[in-house]
Interface confidence: low
Amino acid sequence: ASVGLPSVSLDLPRLSIQKDILTIKANTTLQITCRGQRDLDWLWPNNQSGSEQRVEVTECSDGLFCKTLTIPKVIGNDTGAYKCFYRETDLASVIYVYVQDYRSPFIASVSDQHGVVYITENKNKTVVIPCLGSISNLNVSLCARYPEKRFVPDGNRISWDSKKGFTIPSYMISYAGMVFCEAKINDESYQSIMYIVVVVGYRIYDVVLSPSHGIELSVGEKLVLNCTARTELNVGIDFNWEYPSSKHQHKKLVNRDLKTQSGSEMKKFLSTLTIDGVTRSDQGLYTCAASSGLMTKKNSTFVRVHEKPFVAFGSGMESLVEATVGERVRIPAKYLGYPPPEIKWYKNGIPLESNHTIKAGHVLTIMEVSERDTGNYTVILTNPISKEKQSHVVSLVVYVPPQIGEKSLISPVDSYQYGTTQTLTCTVYAIPPPHHIHWYWQLEEECANEPSQAVSVTNPYPCEEWRSVEDFQGGNKIEVNKNQFALIEGKNKTVSTLVIQAANVSALYKCEAVNKVGRGERVISFHVTRGPEITLQPDMQPTEQESVSLWCTADRSTFENLTWYKLGPQPLPIHVGELPTPVCKNLDTLWKLNATMFSNSTNDILIMELKNASLQDQGDYVCLAQDRKTKKRHCVVRQLTVLERVAPTITGNLENQTTSIGESIEVSCTASGNPPPQIMWFKDNETLVEDSGIVLKDGNRNLTIRRVRKEDEGLYTCQACSVLGCAKVEAFFIIEGAQEKTNLE
């Protein structure tokens, strides 16, 4: 038989016995000659053992590249494959020799008193008991004990082959402690050596690498990789590593078993790969394979080796982040670097510290972003080894959906007298500013609830059909003014005004503002009345502790049953898209008030007096009158605001100043408070008296000293006083230069 593929120029070695199988009797001499075209060698069964001394390999006398193998007095154990081959090649010729020894039909491994067979309990696995035969056509059975069982070849999964041994499914003999082969020759039984049966596990549950991923080092650092295999019991593990630089000088591999808890159904094995000083060539994929013979599992990790410590920003690092108020904002610091850098965040140059609203780490997280979070955020990466720094600026823009200022006054707006010109406003704050503010309208009667209908909180009006203000047929004549931009409370706001040229019909008006992140709307109830009229005496806006009267005047010939009510607190705030319910249709929310009736020649006047008005008196007051003929109720609403009493304060400081004789001094003293304070000026703690050179204007707010003289030098005090106290500011005016004598002197 030939083994290996012949090369172009070399023929296979030629054997003197041209057979694949040779059968000879025991105690005879085996002699085979092999000829070839270059140096030859022989291999024979058991040629690694002491039996080698019996084997003679000699050079042929009649030619180059020829060797003869001789074994005198062969025994059954010499059965096996005899191979003649060219040195350092795979080219070979093989003959299988059976030495028929009826006294010893099984070939024994030299020095083996017994053998060991390792089996697994896998149903699909077979095991080979290596009881090879010196005779090819023996009747062989397998004996297993204890209890004793005999297995006979069945032509299927149980078989015996003289060159291989006895093959049987492993689970059939897993109970046994030992097995042996038995041959019957002429009613005589011959037994092979005993084989101890060792049941081994094979299952590997998992192979875990630690660190498992993202291993980064710089040149010269130590790499330590642990590979842990978890297996079932009775398993032996063989580890095999693959890595980029296999010929590494400083590589160390240590394999050991790990202790597991007693009673554990699992074994652990550990293999540790150590490279003391990594180089760039050590970068790459490291694979650990654990093999139990029947099963192999592997795991890999990528090791990155950097030339030196470094830090840089990754390509995904954004320069602009946009968010809407209330959202959670996450700005990751995306970097490339080894070792991982220290990360510090700054806002407008000020370091950010983590708290319940902001987390400043690998990711800058703002839990609920607000307008004040808008700004430039700088992230600084510092390499902990090289101290190299990289910085990157991220601009955070926080968008605000349109908010309509007037919406906070969740009250039914005052009624409007028939025929008057009225202005409705929507003051919108949005970032970016609204790209449009549109106005819509619809008739009140198309929308109003019938008194019998229950008022729905979510949509008190059944109507949906809003009309554009350009289409004012059947309604009031309207003009929308160009949007104005105003700085209100330090914020840039857009003010849209709608002018109703003549209040003829009751209607609802809606302003809708839209920007890139949302929309806002406000619905205004525009109730037109020919009925009662409300006036406030003495002032539109009383201050607390002052007295105020609300007068409701109605034509006596048209109206009767005048009554004052106060609108109770709203049951629920009005949500976006909801409409205010007409007051007259929903008297449940009104509180009846005591009032005094007066009459003149044409009108009835119902007066409701508030003595010592307090902040609790603020709100919406309703005057209800009934039409004498139709009995229809007419309502007028007036919102009353009571100003809080505030002690005087002076805004701004008086500055000390130096002035030359003959020049002028102009200073301002702005005071606020409620009631409004009185301003007085003092010089050197004496009341300042106006004369031709000293002028006080704007309620004493502005002081002008014309053509100053040396004697105008001194301490000037501005004092603002009300019933709630006084506030004052002081400044020293220095007058320089010599006083000129005048002719008048």
Partner: antibody
């Protein structure tokens, strides 16, 4: 199957704007960066910018700053590229292309290697600018 | 520099090897290993052939390989076949956090 399907061809006058859409399917739209690349007739490829569909963050090539706007609508897994103040030399095929790079937090230690490259491309949208 | 420098055209006979170079600067190819190569057949969208200098996506034959030395990246196609005839573009990530394409190379199989 991962796919990017772009809107149809457009003919525009100089000074106008064009908005090209790119609908993604077969993967998590918010999980990968999206690039826009254009190719003028007989010319090479030109990178215009990218958008992070997750955050809406963008990064534009210097050449297109101020003229290009990249947006996305995550509800319909669609990216948009709008180019304004069109000139005749904007006549080109415009492609959207998904990046291999998944949107993850780069900064986390022990992160796997990061790969970059545009692995899935749209079929292209021809934009012709002519008076 | 507006684009990475590639030869306008290269050619080779079937079975031969060809190499297309892509030269940048320290600010792009020289700093990052983020170079990709794309093949574009006439009238078609580009197709990713190599990413991260030398990595091949699945489905790309191992006849194509990528490498980098200094400021120059290279694409090598061995065992040239007629279906390799196409335009090839490189692209690199830059220190400006943008991407830059090469001018493109027309590969002709003789």
């Amino acid at each position: 199957e991962v796919q990017l399907v772009q809107s149809g061809a457009e003919v525009k006058k100089p000074g106008a704007s064009v908005k090209v859409s790119c609908k993604a399917s077969g993967y998590t739209f918010t999980g990968y960066y999206m690039h826009w690349v254009r190719q003028a007739p007989g010319q090479g490829l030109e990178w215009m910018g990218w958008i992070n569909p997750n955050s809406g963050g963008t990064n534009y090539a210097q050449k297109f700053q101020g003229r290009v706007t990249m947006t996305r609508d995550t509800s319909i897994s669609t990216a948009y590229m709008e180019l304004s103040r069109l000139r005749s030399d904007d006549t080109a095929v415009y492609y959207c292309a998904r990046d291999l790079q998944g949107i993850t937090i780069f900064g986390v230690a022990n992160s796997p290697p990061y790969y970059y490259g545009m692995d899935v491309w749209g079929q292209g949208t021809t934009v012709t600018v002519s008076s | 520099q507006a684009v990475l420098t590639q030869p306008r055209s290269v050619s080779g006979s079937p079975g031969q090897s060809v190499t297309i170079s892509c030269t940048g600067t320290r600010s792009d190819v020289g700093t990052y290993n983020y170079v990709s190569w794309y093949q574009q057949l006439p009238g078609k969208a580009p197709k990713l052939m190599i990413h991260d200098v030398s990595k091949r996506p699945s489905g790309v034959p191992d006849r194509l390989s990528g490498s980098k030395s200094g400021n120059t990246a290279s694409l090598t196609i061995s065992g040239l076949q007629s279906e390799d005839e196409a335009d090839y573009y490189c692209i690199s990530y830059t220190l400006h956090r943008t991407w830059m394409f090469g001018g493109g190379t027309k590969l002709t199989v003789l």
